[in-house]
């Protein structure tokens, strides 16, 4: 993927500084495994510059390769909770719409830990909506230094 | 956040390539939970290009959104050490000065593991000093491939 | 490290957009602890833009500071597998050739977990080949959302 001559002449801002860092707003209703996110300076240190939120889900507005990262910490958790005393807890980040592009991008199980954290590079297209599905019966922490989700445009 | 016309005309270097990757130097004295870092080519593969070290703590010299990442591995550790025989071990990365901007940015507990690793996007300002506080009674590894801390400027 | 005047005049593409995200192809033969990677749109969401693969190992083609990231999930794994019933499982990412630059960049043990994920900034040079060595007797998952390895050029 090369930049066109036109792109090379444009100011840097138009090449894509799209970036977002979100904090957990709430979990979904009973049959909805999705986490619902929020962002904005009024909320603390979360922000959206380019991407947008659609009912708590992150929607991409610029094509490109993105670094996607996430950390989720389970609330009131011990290694006992996650391993033996509760249903296995898994976090999956994926494109959930449009349906034609639905795919799991990143998946982690908590096993005997109470936090998962990872990151990956992935191509995303304008209109892709990312969902973060938490299965299991343990509640995620809403502390902003324990649970967060973000994307960063890195290349056309 | 848009680049000003003046910024658009400046050479790329002035837009901010600030970046640092540090290795563990030592832990603090008894009542000081902070980890003390060091960086520079003479030490191996660590470096500072822009940010600086102030008594082992990382100080930011350019405003912007940064990707902050860290990995800490506990020395002489087994899952037994972290779960049953010691005070819970937690790592927190935060702005510790100026006091008016003090906040926890990233927090992880070791639970039954011996390594934590995570990353997040966060706005930082010139003069912010980042501290990495390790609570608990287990010593962190000084191996440069096991324990490291870094920041990367990604956007104004 | 400053950009030369010549570099400042070059189109942005020549400053380095080098980036790759790989998926697991296969493990090595008996005495070879290396993981063998593959990438390309035909395989899914993996890609190489700049770096190249040499017999399943990632080779760098442009000098610079890179963000290296990896996630490896063990297949058919439980916390019991990784802790008590198997040889300790460890993942190390390093420069394996040229031999003169051989070094371990990133090392993680699975302990009682089934996934490791981390990232770090490191200087890499044209011709450096990165190897990912998995020790232990547990097989890594080939699911593309569970096991992946990538690099991103971030600065000259």
């Amino acid at each position: 993927q090369r930049l066109s001559r036109a792109q090379q002449q444009l100011p840097l801002e138009s090449l894509g500084w799209d970036i977002a860092e979100l904090q957990l707003n709430h979990t979904g209703p009973q049959q909805d495994p999705r986490l619902y996110w929020q962002g904005g300076p009024a909320l603390g240190r979360s922000f959206l510059h380019g991407p947008e939120l659609d009912k708590g889900q992150l929607r991409i507005r610029r094509d490109g390769i993105y670094m996607v990262h996430i950390q989720v910490t389970l609330a009131i958790c011990s290694s006992t909770s996650t391993s033996r005393h509760h249903h296995p807890t898994t976090l999956a980040v994926g494109i959930c719409s449009p349906a034609s592009r639905s795919i799991s991008l990143l998946r982690l199980s908590f096993h005997q830990g109470c936090t998962i954290a990872s990151q990956r590079l992935t191509p995303l297209a304008r209109g892709d909506t990312l969902c973060t599905n938490l299965t299991g019966t343990l509640l995620p922490s809403r502390n902003t230094d324990e649970t967060f989700f973000g994307v960063q445009w890195v290349r056309p | 956040q848009r680049l000003s016309r003046a910024q658009q005309q400046l050479p790329l270097e002035s837009l901010g390539w600030d970046i640092a990757e540090l290795q563990l130097n030592h832990t603090g004295p008894q009542q000081d939970p902070r980890l003390y870092w060091q960086g520079g080519p003479a030490l191996g593969r660590s470096f500072l290009h822009g940010p600086e070290l102030d008594k082992g703590q990382l100080r930011i010299r350019r405003d912007g959104i940064y990707m902050v990442h860290i990995q800490v591995t506990l020395a002489i550790c087994s899952s037994t050490s972290t779960s049953r025989h010691h005070h819970p071990t937690t790592l927190a990365v935060g702005i510790c000065s100026p006091a008016s901007r003090s906040i926890s940015l990233l927090r992880l507990s070791f639970h039954q593991g011996c390594t934590i690793a995570s990353q997040r996007l966060t706005p930082l300002a010139r003069g912010d000093t980042l501290c990495t506080n390790l609570t608990g009674t287990l010593l962190p590894s000084r191996n440069t491939d096991e324990t490291f801390f870094g920041v990367q400027w990604v956007r104004p | 490290q400053r950009l030369s005047r010549a570099q400042q005049q070059l189109p942005l593409e020549s400053l380095g957009w080098d980036i790759a995200e790989l998926q697991l192809n296969h493990t090595g033969p008996q005495q070879d602890p290396r993981l063998y990677w593959q990438g390309g749109p035909a395989l899914g969401r993996s890609f190489l833009h700049g770096p190249e693969l040499d017999k399943g190992q990632l080779r760098i083609r442009r000098d610079g500071i890179y963000m290296v990231h990896i996630q490896v999930t063990l297949a058919i794994c439980s916390s019991t597998s990784t802790s008590r019933h198997h040889h300790p499982t460890t993942l190390a990412v390093g420069i394996c050739s040229p031999a003169s630059r051989s070094i371990s960049l990133l090392r993680l043990s699975f302990h009682q977990g089934c996934t490791i994920a981390s990232q770090r900034l490191t200087p890499l040079a044209r011709g450096d080949t990165l190897c990912t060595n998995l020790t232990g007797t547990l097989l890594p998952s080939r699911n593309t959302d569970e096991t992946f390895f990538g690099v991103q050029w971030v600065r000259p």
Epitope: A75, H86, H87, T137, L139 | - | -
Partner: antibody
Framework: EVQMVQSGAEVKKPGASVKVSCKAS????????IHWVRQAPGQGLEWMGD????????SYNQKFRDRVTMTRDTSTSTVYMELSSLRSEDTAVYYC????????????WGQGTLVTVSS | DIVMTQSPDSLAVSLGERATINCRAS??????????MHWYQQKPGQPPKLLIY???NLESGVPDRFSGSGSGTDFTLTISSLQAEDVAVYYC?????????FGGGTKVEIK
């Protein structure tokens, strides 16, 4: 529809044991922990413990730890709560309960089983 | 164990009037961005019914005249306009740690 159906009332003598069953339906049995809560006549509610049907592991209120055992039979989606060394103050309605999404609060309850301990 | 203290023990309120029940925990039940306090309604001969979870979330199917508030150690259940079918005993419960404990109950009657 989630349902929790408990076994019938029991009368026991002091020192004996009682085993109350709770059959769950309407959801995947091995997903949600099942808790036991008791209520003495005219009194409040008391949490006794819970069991995770996926593994059979249980957590007990320290007050009952030496006398209570919770087990499960995944083939019939049934959990059991056995209380031993019964005393008159164990006379109560025993409820099983589970949750709808996250653990910690109880959206679904059994109808209750009255256990009377009397000589 | 965390001790839950409800007040008042009983409450008589006119139909259509507001009823307020308080619950105090012996130490904070708030952590990780939540308050682990839940409220139940129990009518004679029936099991308890969940009304409010995590301090202020209305359980599905519960009339919106019920609301919860509070954080830390002090919590309130409010019935904004008492109806005849609201006559019952109300319990608070925490799930901050094991063992979970309940308040002693508040009996609500019509004046």
């Amino acid at each position: 529809e989630v349902q929790m159906v408990q076994s019938g009332a029991e009368v026991k003598k002091p020192g004996a044991s009682v085993k109350v069953s709770c059959k769950a339906s309407g959801y995947t049995f091995t997903t949600y922990n099942i808790h036991w809560v008791r209520q003495a006549p005219g009194q409040g509610l008391e949490w006794m413990g819970d069991i995770y049907p996926g593994t059979g592991d249980a957590s007990y209120n320290q007050k009952f730890r030496d006398r209570v055992t919770m087990t499960r039979d995944t083939s019939t989606s049934t959990v059991y709560m056995e209380l031993s060394s019964l005393r008159s103050e164990d006379t109560a309605v025993y409820y099983c309960a589970t949750f709808s999404r996250f653990d910690g609060w109880f959206a679904y309850w059994g109808q209750g089983t009255l256990v009377t301990v009397s000589s | 164990d965390i001790v839950m203290t409800q007040s008042p023990d009983s409450l008589a309120v006119s139909l259509g009037e507001r009823a307020t029940i308080n619950c105090r925990a012996s130490r904070s039940v708030s952590t990780s961005g939540y308050s682990y306090m839940h409220w139940y309604q129990q009518k004679p001969g029936q099991p308890p019914k969940l009304l409010i979870y995590l301090a202020d979330n209305l359980e599905s199917g519960v009339p919106d005249r019920f609301s919860g508030s509070g954080s830390g150690t002090d919590f309130t259940l409010t019935i904004s306009s008492l109806q005849a079918e609201d006559v019952a005993v109300y319990y608070c419960q925490h799930s901050r740690e094991l063992p979970y404990t309940f308040g002693g109950g508040t009996k609500v009657e019509i004046k």
